[in-house]
Interface confidence: low
């Protein structure tokens, strides 16, 4: 099967945009050449991460491929098209009034994208309206070179934002994860994601989610009551993609949020998370920037214990070992801590109930000039059975009104050398962070100083 072309391809014309956006009137996605479609998939999944500068880890500890390197490599493989779903863009330092050498990797990425357009490779970007980066001109710069850009008015459509962070390259390769198109994501923020190479079935499934954003980026777009059949997914928690990843039997599927952006066959992101938690029998390890069993962006906030209850039920009802590692930075909302302490209070080793919560504090060091950085921004979970890599923080709004995606992967142990499954690799990364000196137990946190490194 192949992804049919969606019904409409108009280009959003933002008012007073200084660069020439008119290039965007042609289709953002051209079907791949038949020959390319017929190539046999040889799927490969690589975990990628960003470690903030000046955050040394113990020698010999496990690590993933550096995100910046992976992104540049992925662009090097591009031959026809690159589709990017992104919350916002801020790849250059002066976007945020910062002159810091650590922004150079972001600038290299912008340079690479400009070169890509020079090679007549189609670049289509679906980005959020509202956006965080009002001063960034990355997208105008790329549009001047021929990029197609659409702003998806999630604020108007669902009262949320487009919070997804994924790429589809040539309808074959994928990046998805916690990192925004932001130079800080490459050098100043702790991130985790996955790159999947040579996997057209999964890539073209994720492309359908990109296309849901794309069609909502035309003027006066409205959410369809029912999404047309060509947006439907063939892969979900009941019927995941089955394939060999580097020779290892693997199942995988993409989930999405909010429900309004889940066409037929697409597993909802919250449902995917709950399913992974529900199937765990030994452990659930999660690393998230924020954990709130409430709404975050509605006033007054509502209590929303769905994920909290699932973790409690797993620990209390099945004896599953639960570990939650939460981001802690200068911009962390301190009202989160009572919820974390409440969850940890359930722990009772004598009754075989194991719930541990730590915060991960990235020392600011001499990087205090860089706002909204030096934090663990990851959004992943791993059990003995599955790996979940997402784009959503853990509170209600991210699943009910905000656009995000998740990837659920399960690999068969025993079919390869020990330690090679994706879930085992992710567990090792989690345990590296959990046992590092930057992971601090809640007992060690004094109120009012919650997220300042005391090292």
């Amino acid at each position: 099967w192949q992804v049919p072309r969606p019904p409409t391809w108009g280009q959003v014309q933002p008012k007073d945009v200084p660069r020439s956006w008119e290039h965007g009137s042609s289709p953002a996605w051209e079907p791949l050449e038949a020959e390319a479609r017929q190539q046999r998939d040889s799927c490969q999944l690589v975990l990628v991460e960003s470690i903030p500068q000046d955050l040394p880890s113990a020698a010999g500890s496990p690590s993933a491929q550096p995100l910046g390197q992976a992104w540049l490599q992925l662009l090097d493989t591009a031959q026809e098209s690159v589709h990017v779903a992104s919350y916002y863009w801020s790849l250059t330092g002066p976007d945020i009034g910062v002159n810091d050498s650590s922004s150079q990797l972001g600038e290299a990425l912008l340079q690479k994208l400009q070169q890509l357009l020079g090679r007549n490779i189609s670049l289509a970007v679906a980005t959020s309206s509202p956006t965080l980066a009002r001063t960034s001109t990355d997208l105008q710069v790329l549009a001047a070179r021929g990029a197609h850009v659409r702003q998806v008015p999630m604020g108007r459509l669902t009262r949320g934002v487009l919070h997804s962070k994924f790429w589809v390259v040539d309808g074959r390769h994928i990046y998805m994860g916690s990192a925004n198109m932001d130079w800080r994501s490459l050098t100043q923020v702790k991130e985790l994601g996955a790159v999947i190479y040579n996997c057209s079935h999964l890539a073209q499934d994720l492309e359908k989610t990109f296309q849901t954003y794309w069609v909502l980026g035309v003027p006066k777009a409205v959410l369809p009551k029912t999404w047309p059949q060509n947006f439907s997914s063939h892969f979900n928690r009941f019927q995941p993609f089955h394939g060999l990843f580097d020779g290892v039997p693997t199942t995988a599927y993409f989930s999405a949020s909010p429900p309004a952006l889940c066409p037929q066959g697409r597993t909802r992101d919250l449902e995917a998370l709950l399913a992974v938690m529900g199937s765990a029998q030994e452990f659930i390890y999660a690393s998230v920037m924020e954990y709130f069993p409430t709404t975050r962006f509605s006033h007054p906030p509502r209590y929303w214990p769905v994920l909290d209850n699932a973790l409690r039920a797993a620990a209390f009802g099945k004896g599953v070992r639960v570990r939650l590692l939460v981001g802690c930075g200068l911009n962390t909302d301190p009202t989160m801590f009572p919820y974390l302490r409440s969850l940890q209070a359930l722990s009772n080793p004598a009754a075989n109930v194991s719930v541990d919560v730590k915060v991960f504090i990235v020392p600011v060091g001499n990087h205090s000039n860089i706002p909204f950085s030096r934090v663990n921004h990851s959004k992943f979970m791993v059990t003995e059975k599955a790996a979940y890599i997402g784009t959503s923080n853990w509170s209600e709004d991210y699943f009910s009104s905000t656009a995000g995606v998740g990837l659920v992967v399960t690999q068969s142990p025993g079919a390869q050398p020990a330690g090679a499954t994706v879930q085992e690799q992710l567990r090792q990364l989690f345990e590296r962070d959990w046992s590092s000196r930057y992971a601090v137990g809640l007992d060690g946190q004094a109120p009012g100083q919650d997220c300042v490194w005391q090292g």
Epitope: P18, R19, S20, T92, P94, D95, N99, E107, L110, Q111, Q114, Q115, L117, G118, R119, N120, T135, T137, Q140, V141, A144
Partner: antibody, heavy 118, light 107 residues
Framework: QVQLQQPGAELVKPGTSVKMSCKAS????????MHWVKQRPGQGLEWIGD????????NYNEKFKSKATLTVDTSSSTAYMQLSSLTSEDSAVYYC???????????WGQGTSVTVSS | DIQMTQTTSSLSASLGDRVTISCRAS??????LNWYQQKPDGTVKLLIY???RLHSGVPSRFSGSGSGTDYSLTISNLEQEDIATYFC?????????FGGGTKLETK
């Protein structure tokens, strides 16, 4: 190191055309835009257009669209600009410059001085 | 097209002086402002890109600042080798455009 070599001068007759070269070395020629810039005697700089050697993709300043044609020969890492229907207004120094970080022109040739005279 | 204006076409200063050259764009160019130095022999060099980024090999006495429509190049301690003409250029909207230049001379 990055170098852009241009011939020093061209003397041409009105109504004819001239094709000037810019030989690049010290970097991957196909990965960077090549800009062309005009400077009339005692005047400022005017951007003519640019070309991406990896695909022959071009952008032109509207003012020079019917005057200049940009091409490349990737086998010799050389960029060319042809100016047609020459008049005295075309007498100027023409620079090639590599498009580097964020479209800044980071390395420049020495310039080719074109004199249009009968 | 975006017009770039360098109001001072020539400037006299003494060696060791702090010199500031300004440049104004006809509309917001979002920091996509580059500065070039042209020596009397015609040689052109990039000094500053993206408002404030020093190009490799450029002495640290050169610095750039600005935002929106107004930008400036500062030479903190003028040296003889800095005697040249300085051009600003916007890289925000095609076609790229240059200012008319500011010729720096010694008193």
């Amino acid at each position: 190191q990055v170098q852009l070599q241009q011939p020093g001068a061209e003397l041409v007759k009105p109504g004819t055309s001239v094709k000037m070269s810019c030989k690049a070395s010290g970097y991957t020629f196909t990965s960077y835009w090549m800009h062309w810039v005009k400077q009339r005697p005692g005047q400022g700089l005017e951007w003519i257009g640019d070309i991406y050697p990896g695909s022959d993709s071009t952008n032109y300043n509207e003012k020079f669209k019917s005057k200049a044609t940009l091409t490349v020969d990737t086998s010799s890492s050389t960029a060319y600009m042809q100016l047609s229907s020459l008049t005295s207004e075309d007498s100027a120094v023409y620079y090639c410059a590599r498009g580097g970080w964020l479209d800044a022109m980071d390395y420049w040739g020495q310039g080719t001085s074109v004199t249009v005279s009968s | 097209d975006i017009q770039m204006t360098q109001t001072t076409s020539s400037l006299s200063a003494s060696l060791g002086d702090r010199v500031t050259i300004s440049c104004r764009a006809s509309q917001d160019i979002s920091n996509y402002l580059n500065w070039y130095q042209q020596k009397p022999d015609g040689t052109v060099k990039l000094l500053i890109y993206y408002t404030s980024r020093l190009h490799s090999g450029v002495p640290s006495r050169f610095s750039g600042s600005g935002s929106g429509t107004d930008y400036s190049l500062t030479i903190s301690n003028l040296e003889q080798e800095d005697i040249a003409t300085y051009f600003c250029q916007q890289g925000n909207t095609l076609p790229w455009t240059f200012g008319g230049g500011t010729k720096l001379e010694t008193k």
